[in-house]
Structure formats: C-alpha cells, structure tokens
C-alpha cells in the first residue's frame, strides 16, 4: 500500500489517499483494488497506463485536483470501471478525445467544474453503459453534432452553467433512454425545431436562465414524457409569434414553471401561461 | 472559495421591517440566484425567495406581499426587506447560494427575534 | 404549501447504517438534494441531483430517488455525522423550492 494512503478489504479493495498532498499518481497501488480514491490532493498529470495494473477497478475519483492534463492512455485497461469522477480540476480545459474510450462498463462520468471549453468529437464514442454525465459549470459554447450519439442508455445528462448559445438539430441525437436534461444557466438563444428529436422518454427538461425569446413547438411535440419543463427567466417575447408556444403550454399535461413574458413592454413579466389568445397581439 | 458573510439585526419589534445583507465574496452576484431561507423553531427550512442577474426577483407566495429582495452589484451583495413582522416570523434567516435548483452555499445564519 | 415527508429522528450505532428517507407520490421523477445541519452551524449540501456526492463529502454518503422515495444512506456512521438532515426537490405546483421536516441522526 502507497505511504500516504490506507488499503482495505471490506467492502471492496480500496486504496484511499484523500486530501494528502500527493502531487502524483501513487506508486505500488494495490492491483486487487477495486476502488481507488484520490481526491483533494494536488495531482496535475495522470499519466498514460497509470491504472493499468487494476484490472478489477470499478470506482476512481480523482476530483478536487488540478489536473492539467489526463494523457489519452491514462484510463488503458480498465475494462470494469463504472464510475469516474474528474470533476473539480478547473485546470483540465480539454481532454483527448481517445481519453474514454475502452470504458465499455462505464456509468457515471463526472466532468463537472474542469474548465472544459469545448467536446472533442467522438469523445463519448463507444460509451454504451453510461447513464450520468456531469458536465456543469464548464464553459462549453457549442454542443457540436452526434457528440452524444453512442450514450443510447444515459438517463441523466447535465449541461447547466455553461455558456451554451444554441441547441442544433443534430446535439442530442441518439438519446432515446433520456430522462432529465438540464439546460438551464446557459446563453441559449436558438433551438433548432428537431433539436430533442431522439428524446421520446425525456421526463424533465430544464431551460430556465437562458437567453430565448421564442421557443418552437415543433421542438416539443417529440417529448411525449415530458413531465416537468421549466422556462423562466428567458427573454420571452409574447406578440403573435408566442402563439404556438401559448397554445402548447395549454394543452402540456405535466408542470411547467411561469414563463414570465419580457415583450412587449405592456405584458412585461405576465406569464404567458395565463394570457387570453388575443393578447398576443402584432409582429 | 464562495462564502457569505450576513449582517444585521438580531432584534426586530413587531410591526416593524426585518431587513439583513448578504455579502458575497469569490463569486459575482452577476451569476446564479441568490435567495434566502429561513427556519422558524421547531420547524422546517422555508425558502423566501430568490434575485436573479440583479432585477429578476421571486417570492414564496405565502410571504409574496411583505418581501423585498434587492441587490448591489457594486458592493457585491443582496438584501432582504420583510416587512409588518411578527412573532411568526422569528427565525434563523440564512442567505445561499441557489444553482437554480440546489443551495450549494451557504451564510452562517442570523438569528432574528420579534418582540417588543 | 408542502412539505416533503422525512421521520422526525433516526438513532443508529457507531459503525452501522442509517437511512433517511423522504416521501412524496413520484418523487422519483424529481431530483432530490440533500443537506446536513450540525448545531450551531448553517446547512451544507452533502448529495444533489439524487445520487451526487459533493466534493469533500466521505464516500460512505450515498443517495438514491425512486418510485415513491428519496432515500439518504450513511454507511459506518461515526459520531460527527450526528447532524439534522433535509431533503430538499423543486415543487412544480408552487413553482419553488421546498424541503422536508428534516431527520434528526443520533449516533449511539
């Protein structure tokens, strides 16, 4: 067992080293370990093949680090791991896109509060048991086609806290199992009108905080699941265009929030919800 | 690191408006929600309401007429008005940061007593 | 307004297992937080998103949400954790946050 961590049996082989320090991957991590903890400590590099010898690992957390940089090797061999937490290492800003691949039994992955600027493409390829993906409070701008496209049975996926500008037709393709998107505290000022196309089993969808002042209904009439919307705090604009939406938000069966109108200046802040047919009036 | 630091009075006499600032320090009141909670005692937290990008404000309904919650991007921080008090209102009122949906951080709490 | 169903108290010995549970119909389909509140001090979110750990927070924290309930679990409770505990969704009937009664852990 590594100096700085304690090794035990029960319930699962776990080499724990929180919160001491470490500027480095351990040397001499038990090959039996199941779990590996890591966080909290000063780690900046995880290096190709670091894990390669722990055949049997199925929980690493390697968050509240300062991971600047996770060679696309570091994760080689570890055919059984099912949670991977890097979340808190606000220094990564980007992973190679290979990074991931081979995780076929991954189920969670946490990439929340890396920094991260952009997905590289086929950075999620070949995920097929992921059900959570954190990726929060990132700066993410664009959500680039098909990036989600093997992920058929992620339930949860968190993109709020970026700075998200449009949702394209192509963003979610391939989410069939989709239970809650979260969307909300980005810049999104467009979604494309087959954007959650894929999402026929999508309960919650949260886009409050971001920068639409229109939404199209044909968005929405794929979301047969849909439960619990919310869209406040949008720049909602509520003349004849906000028809659709108005007429949609009648008939939706699930709860939504208020969808506070901004224009025109007469039904500032009335909700959309509650207004008659005719006040969405001129365009 | 996110901390809030609460300020104001412990003591406020019935009838009178409780008011309590929140200052907040690594992070821009720019950003998130920011509300306030308060937890009579013996009972339950209970949410008073939330500012947004400085001027969006929303307000449990159940206090929706006596609240006010305001903001000072130049100082960094929010405020609460409750006004019209009574003993009912005697609680620890705490400010938090709200993700939107979660309270990630949290003021140290404010105890406030209504009596004359 | 509502309230999210928590037990008044759950007693557990050093070294076992407590669970906190929170009701409501279909709370499963809603995301559940949770947060502690050691005496004196002010809350501190522990689990969000049903199932997610804060940083920080011992692994022996765990979370899960479905059908019915939200449950809060602590594996080989130790003293320290002696805290009230709340659970805490987004009520979409109010159109804001509520929270449950809370749970006050004794450790034994």
């Known amino acids: 067992c590594p100096g700085a961590c304690v090794c035990y049996n029960e319930p699962k082989v776990t080499t724990s080293c929180p919160q001491q320090g470490l500027q480095a991957v351990p040397v001499g991590i038990p090959a039996a370990s199941q779990r590996i903890f890591l966080h909290g400590n000063r780690i900046s590099h995880v290096p190709a093949a670091s894990f390669r010898a722990c055949r049997n690992l199925t929980i690493l957390w390697l968050h509240s680090n300062v991971l600047a940089r996770i060679d696309a090797a570091a994760f080689t061999g570890l055919a059984l791991l099912e949670q991977l937490d890097l979340s808190d290492n606000a220094q990564l800003r980007s992973v190679d896109p290979a990074t991931f691949h081979g995780l076929g039994r991954l189920h969670t992955l946490h990439l929340d509060r890396c920094g991260l600027q952009e997905l590289g493409p086929g950075l999620f390829r070949g995920l097929a048991a992921l059900q959570y993906l954190y990726l929060q409070d990132n700066a993410l701008q664009a959500l680039p086609d098909d990036t989600f496209r093997d992920l058929g049975n992620l339930t949860h996926l968190f993109l709020h806290g970026n700075r998200i500008s449009s949702v394209p037709e192509r963003a979610f393709r391939g989410l069939h199992s989709l239970d809650r998107l979260l969307l909300h505290q980005n810049r999104v000022a467009h979604v494309h009108p087959h954007a959650f196309r894929d999402l026929g089993r999508l309960m919650t969808l949260y886009l409050f905080a971001n920068n639409l002042s229109a939404l199209p209904t044909e968005a929405l009439a794929p979301l047969r699941a849909l439960q619990y919307l919310r869209l406040n705090d949008n720049p909602w604009v509520c003349d004849c265009r906000a028809r659709p939406l108005w007429a949609w938000l009648q008939k939706f069966r699930g709860s939504s929030s208020e969808v506070p109108c901004s224009l025109p200046q007469r039904l500032a802040g009335r909700d959309l919800k509650r207004l008659a047919a005719n006040d969405l009036q001129g365009c | 690191q996110v901390q809030l630091q609460q300020s104001g009075p412990g003591l406020v006499k019935p009838s009178e408006t409780l008011s309590l600032t929140c200052t907040v320090s690594?992070?821009?009141?720019?950003?998130?929600?920011w509300s306030w909670v308060r937890q009579p005692p013996g009972k339950t937290l209970e949410w008073i309401g939330y500012i947004f990008d400085t001027r969006t404000t929303k307000y449990n309904p159940s206090l929706k007429s006596r609240v006010t919650i305001s903001a000072d991007t130049s100082k960094n921080q929010f405020s609460l008005k409750l006004s019209s008090v009574t003993a009912a209102d005697t609680a620890v009122y705490y400010c938090?940061?709200?993700?939107?949906?979660?309270?990630?951080?949290w003021g140290q709490g404010t105890m406030v007593t209504v009596s004359s | 307004q509502s309230v999210l169903t928590q037990p008044p108290s759950v007693s557990v010995a050093a070294g076992q297992t407590a669970r906190i549970t929170c009701g409501e119909a279909n709370i499963g389909r809603r995301s559940v937080h949770w947060y502690q509140r050691r005496p004196g001090q002010a809350p501190l979110m522990v689990i969000y998103y049903d199932t997610a750990r804060r940083s920080g927070i011992p692994e022996r924290f765990s979370g899960s949400n479905s059908g019915d309930t939200a449950t809060l679990t602590i594996s080989r409770v130790e003293a320290g954790d002696e805290a009230d505990y709340y659970c805490q969704a987004w009520d979409f009937s109010s159109d804001h946050p509520v929270f449950g009664g809370g749970t006050k852990v004794t450790v034994l």
């Open positions: 938090a940061r709200d993700a939107g949906t979660i309270f990630d951080y």
């Open positions: 690594g992070d821009s009141i720019t950003s998130y929600y």
